[in-house]
């Protein structure tokens, strides 16, 4: 077909403009409003219900096929009879002090039903009882302070640990690995109360007795934990309970700041050990085990009945069918289920994606469907795992590789309303910022300049001058898959706050009760511009994938993203040069590699200038090189104990889900390698990884070359 | 009444290890719940801190002497000691025993303190 | 680190005069502040703790004021027995602990 009937005779940056002047920020309101009316927890009727209608709307918006795809995978609860609570226990054994059993809900919802207290998801069941031992973050680090400088055991006690910094999954096995025999987190006001704003209602901080709940879970990437490979559908086989993915092994509760006053104010033991370790409660913040003085023989005792169910769950699928690639895939994606209401996670991402569909809707209705096939997916049960994202990719997953161009995230649009965040492969950065330069900025005092402007000057790059920051892809969203599995480009933006002056873990509200519609309106975004920024950064990008002629992908940035990679690592392991000389570890090989890459894919770019865009054959072969890229840097055997975390370039940080770690299979075997018992093994590793590393850059360099 | 004497050479060679000793009279260690630490004070910068312990043998050390610096406790014989090694003519100076205000107050404001020992560092 | 910056370095009054000394952090410190009198030849004397309360057997006429990163030592009818130098110190953020150069108050 010649390629104007694809477009209606609209020329590409035409029908652009007309699918972007087609976003409304009042539609956007609208969205979230029916989207945050109950709450939608997944594996829940509610959830059914706004599949359904997510499905009915989306087939009126235009889409060609729209599918509710489900599954039954592993999901946790709370027993509604028998609640979850902690208590402080005198030495006759009697409750002194017990935690709250729920939040206070919102003005306005106090009637809304179906609230799910806060509980830490897939908790086991346990009522241990013993002394107390404050963790800080229970990150890596805290625990190698404590134990390592402070001599400070945590076997056979319950350590308490605040939110932030890392995914609340690491922090849980961080405990396990130290001996603890259960878990408290909490929300500390130096992390989830910004000072000078007010608590919710009146402002948009955290209550005293606000709660975050959250999975915690270690999966890796497996999906979900009963079938670690393949999809939960009727034929699944399921492992038992016993050798499920992930599980943790000791009990674990989230509590809010005004019942942790009262677990940690009279904690005994030696102080903190330096003032990073000081929250903002008015407590010593002693590091225990155990209380002081006069408290010393008080207890604490935790009580958790959450079970786990085999739960069915729904993800929407929409496709929109391409025009001239209808075997190439340009996919949108973000949840649905949320803890409570959902009013900015996942709701306000939510919101976006429908208005987008909405948009390519209506431009279809007028006879201009995209170049590619772009499919939109509402997905279920992100909160306990990335469970339907996954689920639905390892069951389409011999497709996705073969024709997955792109995968574009779309959960909370908002964090914050200070600048835009993005975080994307590095084929994907001049993408990002050439279609920022051609939006306007909502920022205040930027009127009339480009988001590209207003971005660069509020998040410049560390690296480059004049250019705004891009981030790594770690994971603790539905791109995990995607990227770190499959291999298919991936990115995600949205609006987050100013990270210099505001020190907050996420947003104080962050899956809590007080996570809602007004709490958007009235604080957040009220007129909705931000969103509207977010639904045309994220329907341009999807746009741009699905209708360029040529895949608007850059391998020169992954070049120049590679080099800055393989000097990191390189300069970590240069801490230990006496090692490095007795064992022989050299980066020459990855270095050539990476000058190798670097040369292909400057060729390649000559070759893209000078291609005959006329030629559907050479056009499709550069394409497809383009295309693969990023899936030349998957290894079929995965990472080290991580099978599903297969990309060599990039994968979410051991020590932090959220956070990607570039190398990883390399920094981790140089991880904490000084404290190694065998250290001949543990360089042979890193020799084996270098190895790795350098042989995956190669053979990504190859797949640029010159096909013939 | 708590009490703190600190003890050792006055005279130190450059590049070996210095050690003081800080006697406690009148509390235990391990009871008291207050946390025992070193300052020194020299004419050029001042008063120092050092670094502090804890009975549990949590310790806290200045960033700028941690890779030279041990304390230890003695509980048995009440005795704290400070163990500085590859000294040289910078840590000479007065050096203080001290008590940081307490009990269960944790690295807070220093309310008791020895008279103090000088440390030459020469050859 | 913390620096703490004392001023006036020396401050030279007569007995039965006030003295106010200051004492500035260079980020909060909160209220975790101290003031320590030293005469010579002796260990330091804590005066006052929590940026205003007294040490025990401290005289009234010592006071501090003062949060976050201004300090105020005041001492409001000086005693002969009062001059020596005086020295602030944080304990909100450490390691490492840190002290001012120190006030020295001379008999005019």
């Known amino acids: 077909k010649p390629s104007n009937e694809a477009t209606g005779n609209v020329s590409h940056s035409g029908m652009k403009k007309e699918f972007l002047h087609e976003l409304k920020a009042e539609n956007i309101k609208k969205f979230l409003y029916n989207f945050t009316r109950t709450p939608h927890l997944a594996g829940t009727q509610n959830n059914f219900e706004l599949a359904k209608q997510i499905h009915d709307q989306w087939k009126e918006f235009g889409l060609d096929l729209v599918e509710l795809s489900h599954y039954d995978v592993l999901l946790s609860y709370p027993n509604k009879t028998h609640p979850n609570y902690i208590s402080i226990i005198n030495e006759d054994g009697n409750e002194i002090f017990k935690t709250s059993l729920s939040e206070q809900p919102p003005p306005g919802y106090e009637n809304i039903s179906d609230v799910v207290p806060p509980y830490s998801a897939f908790s086991p069941q346990g009522t241990p009882e013993g002394d107390l031992v404050y963790v800080n973050y229970a990150r890596t680090e805290d625990f190698f302070k404590l134990e390592r400088e402070m001599k400070i055991s945590c076997s056979g006690k319950i350590v308490i640990a605040r939110y932030g910094k890392v995914f609340r999954g690491n922090m849980v096995k961080n405990a396990q690995l130290a001996g603890a025999k259960g878990m408290i987190l909490y929300s500390d006001p130096a992390d989830y109360f910004v000072p000078a704003v007010k608590s919710y209602p009146d402002g948009w901080n955290l209550p005293g007795g606000g709660v975050q709940r959250g999975n915690v879970l270690n999966l890796n990437g497996a999906g979900d934990p009963l079938t670690p490979g393949y999809p939960a559908n009727e034929h699944a086989y399921r492992h038992e309970l016993t050798n499920a993915v992930g599980l943790p092994s000791i009990p674990v509760h989230p509590i809010g700041y005004d019942d942790a006053q009262k677990l940690l104010e009279h904690m005994g033991g030696p102080a903190p050990p330096d003032s990073s370790w000081k929250g903002g409660l008015k407590v010593p913040y002693n590091v225990g085990p155990g209380f002081a003085g006069n408290f010393s023989t008080q207890k604490v005792k935790m009580h958790i009945h959450s079970y786990t169910k085999v739960t069915r769950i729904y993800n929407v699928i929409g496709t929109l069918k391409g025009a001239l690639e209808p075997d190439r895939y340009v996919i949108l994606g973000g949840h649905r289920d949320a803890w409570v209401f959902g009013g900015i996670d996942p709701q306000s991402g939510a919101a976006v994606v429908h208005e987008i569909v909405r948009s390519f809707g209506t431009l279809k209705k007028k006879g201009r469907r995209p170049r590619r096939t772009i499919l939109f997916a509402s997905w279920d049960a992100e909160e306990f795992g990335l469970l339907g994202s996954t689920e639905w990719a390892e069951e389409h997953s011999r497709l996705l590789q073969e024709r997955g161009v792109a995968y574009i995230n779309a959960d909370s649009s908002i964090e914050g309303n200070y600048t835009l965040r993005v975080d994307c492969t590095p084929l994907m950065y001049s993408l990002v910022y050439n279609l920022t330069k051609e939006l306007q900025s909502p920022d205040e005092g930027f009127e009339g300049k480009s988001l590209y402007d207003s971005w660069k000057e509020k998040s410049p790059s560390p690296e480059f001058i004049g250019m705004p920051r891009i981030s790594k892809l770690g994971s603790g969203n539905d791109f995990e898959v995607f990227f770190q599995r499959l291999g298919i480009a991936s990115g995600r933006a949205r609006y987050t706050k100013n990270w210099k002056t505001n020190k907050v873990s996420s947003y104080p509200l962050y899956h809590s009760v007080y996570e809602t519609y007004e709490l958007v309106v009235k604080f957040y975004d009220p007129t909705f511009k931000y969103h509207l920024t977010v639904a045309q950064v994220r329907g341009a990008m999807v746009f741009e994938l699905a209708n360029s002629i040529v895949l608007p992908f850059d391998c020169q940035s992954y070049a120049v993203a590679l080099k800055k990679y393989a000097d990191t690592i390189y300069n970590i392991s240069m801490k230990h040069p006496q090692e490095m000389k007795a064992y022989m570890i050299s980066f020459d090989s990855l270095f050539s590699a990476v000058n190798n890459f670097t040369d292909v894919a400057s060729k390649f770019n000559q070759r893209l200038q000078e291609l005959d865009k006329s030629n559907p054959i050479l056009l499709r072969i550069m394409n497809d090189q383009l295309m693969y890229l990023e899936r030349a840097f998957i290894d079929p055997l995965g990472l080290p104990g991580r099978p599903f975390y297969r990309h060599i370039i990039y994968a979410p940080s051991s020590h932090n889900k959220y956070a990607g770690e570039s190398f990883p299979g390399i920094y981790d075997a140089l991880f904490d390698i000084s404290s190694k018992v065998n250290a001949s093994k543990a360089w042979n590793e890193v020799k084996r990884q270098i190895s790795i590393a350098t042989f995956t850059v190669q053979a990504a360099a190859e797949t640029l070359r010159e096909v013939a | 009444q708590v009490q703190l004497q600190e003890s050792g050479p006055g005279l130190v060679k450059p590049s070996v290890t210095l050690s003081l000793t800080c006697t406690v009279s009148?509390?235990?260690?391990?009871?008291?719940?207050?946390?025992w630490g070193w300052i020194r004070q020299t004419p050029g910068k001042g008063l120092e801190w050092i670094g502090t312990m804890f009975y549990s043998g949590a310790t806290y050390y200045n960033p700028s002497l941690k890779s030279r610096l041990t304390l230890n406790m003695d509980t048995s014989k009440q005795e704290f000691t400070l163990r500085l090694t590859s000294v040289t003519a910078e840590d000479s100076a007065v050096y203080y025993c001290v008590r940081h205000r307490g009990p269960d107050t944790g690295l807070d404001a220093f309310d008791l303190w020895g008279q103090g020992t000088q440390v030459t560092v020469s050859s | 680190d913390v620096e703490m910056t004392q001023s006036p370095a020396s401050l030279s009054l007569s007995p039965g005069e006030r003295a106010t000394l200051s004492c500035r952090a260079s980020?909060?410190?909160?209220?975790?502040l101290a003031w320590y009198q030293q005469k010579p030849g002796q260990a330091p004397r804590l005066l006052i703790y929590?940026?205003?309360t007294r040490a025990t057997g401290i005289p009234a006429r010592f006071s501090g004021s003062g949060s976050g990163t201004e300090f105020t030592l005041a001492i409001s009818s000086l005693q002969s027995e009062d001059f020596a130098v005086y020295y602030c110190q944080q304990y909100n953020n450490w390691p490492p602990l840190t002290f001012g150069g120190g006030t020295k108050l001379e008999i005019k």
């Open positions: 980020q909060s410190v909160s209220s975790d």
């Open positions: 009148g509390a235990s260690f391990s009871s008291s719940g207050y946390y």
């Open positions: 929590g940026a205003s």
